[in-house]
């Protein structure tokens, strides 16, 4: 069955619900664009999208706001060219993970830099921006295969959808196992894991819609205990 989506005329500052924009789109809504914050994941899918598209229509404000939305959607960006920087939230998330892992006091946290401390990741990963041209298809939340649309309509044309993907580095040191794991007691493996982001897609019945799709988002260490010899 087609998934539940919403119509137009919501407003939430961002061009598309929970999707960052970059480059040419920034000025579409004037200087105040982006001031309202992200739309809620619970909010209906298209509440924001057509505000930018419908020059002719007045909109009603979107009152919902959910900070968790950032974490899910920071890996998607609409842009006229390849984004130059990783998602800001991704960088913040990485830094937070370093701090949490170190379990330092608040006073130390403020002044310590993981890179200077020589910390190493348990699994080596690589991250890059990819387009729908690279992805072609993806799996949606219902397990169906959908086509990821390369272009997304905006008021002055179309922008490309970019996805910030993170996966295990096949050329890295940890391809044989996780770093720092006692090999006498544990079998370890670095595995790419996926999570859901919202993207404009088309299903097998040629129906275009905003759907959650799976993309590679991290490289994690999986352990199994070695049986006694």
């Amino acid at each position: 069955a087609p998934m539940k989506e919403a119509n137009i005329r919501g407003q939430g500052g961002l061009a598309y619900p929970g999707v960052r924009t970059h480059g040419t789109l920034e000025s579409v809504n004037g200087p105040k664009a982006g001031s309202r914050g992200l739309t809620s994941l619970a909010d209906t899918f298209e509440h924001v999208i057509e505000e930018l598209l419908d020059e002719d229509q007045k909109v009603r404000p979107n009152e919902e706001n959910n900070k968790d939305a950032d974490l899910y959607t920071s890996r998607v960006m609409l842009s006229s060219q390849v984004p130059l920087e990783p998602p800001l939230l991704f960088l913040l998330e990485e830094y937070k993970n370093y701090l949490d892992a170190a379990n330092m006091s608040m006073r130390v946290r403020r002044h310590s830099d993981p890179a200077r401390r020589g910390e190493l990741s348990v699994c080596d990963s690589i991250s890059e921006w990819v387009t729908a041209a690279d992805k072609k298809t993806a799996v949606d939340m219902s397990g169906g295969t959908v086509t990821v649309l390369e272009k997304v309509p905006v008021s002055k044309g179309q922008l490309k959808q970019y996805f910030y993907e993170t996966k295990c580095n096949p050329m890295g040191y940890t391809k044989e196992g996780c770093r720092g794991i006692d090999k006498r007691h544990w079998n370890s493996q670095c595995r790419t894991t996926q999570s859901y982001v919202r993207a404009l897609t088309m299903d097998s019945k040629k129906r275009i819609g905003w759907r959650f799709i799976r993309i590679d988002t991290s490289c994690v260490c999986t352990l199994t205990i070695k049986r006694g010899r």
Partner: antibody, heavy 121, light 108 residues
Framework: EVQLLESGGGLVQPGGSLRLSCAAS????????MSWVRQAPGKGLEWVAG?????????YYADSVKGRFTISRDNSKNTLYLQMNSLRAEDTAVYYC?????????????WGQGTTVTVSS | EIVLTQSPATLSVSPGDRATLSCRAS??????LAWYQQKPGQPPSLLIY???TRATDIPDRFSGSGSGTEFTLTISSLQSEDFAVYYC??????????FGGGTKVEIK
Amino acid sequence: EVQLLESGGGLVQPGGSLRLSCAASVFTFSNYYMSWVRQAPGKGLEWVAGINWNGAGDTYYADSVKGRFTISRDNSKNTLYLQMNSLRAEDTAVYYCAKQGVTHYNPMDVWGQGTTVTVSS
Amino acid sequence: EIVLTQSPATLSVSPGDRATLSCRASQGIAGKLAWYQQKPGQPPSLLIYDASTRATDIPDRFSGSGSGTEFTLTISSLQSEDFAVYYCQQYYDWPPLTFGGGTKVEIK
């Protein structure tokens, strides 16, 4: 104000052909799904055909017109078309073009004034 | 194909009174229902979408409600300009996009 203006209607004999046009203005035509809807004299609304914006020629038809009607669009001219072949008396109606949304799951928020097609011998 | 059944076919109401129009879908449509108003010689115009959201510039005397398969359009206090034909339409599962048969709201 957003506008849709249909043209091309008229009187045609059964078995004949007509091509309807719908000119769009004041919105980014190429971004939207578009549809044709008809209304026979004294009757209700009947959806005829739709087309998405994706450029791959993805079209959708009511069973009653499949194989006889063809919907198309020329984004460079901001124009929607309906080629009607093998016309029948029951195709007599006012034909409206309507704008939908970016995705498949949207109502028709802008309608044209309509053009009348009469199929009669 | 999703069939929409509107009732009543005709509703006779006095100006200032409340009018309640019903639309029943043959299967669930996840709230993807619109209401249109059509006056003689004019195209339809969008009143309500997503079952309950008023379209641009629609007065608040018009309200939509319902979910699943049962939907209602309520006009709280009928004005002279509200006497018209009202259609519901589903846009959840298509093709085909389907409309209800219409309800004519006439002056009592």
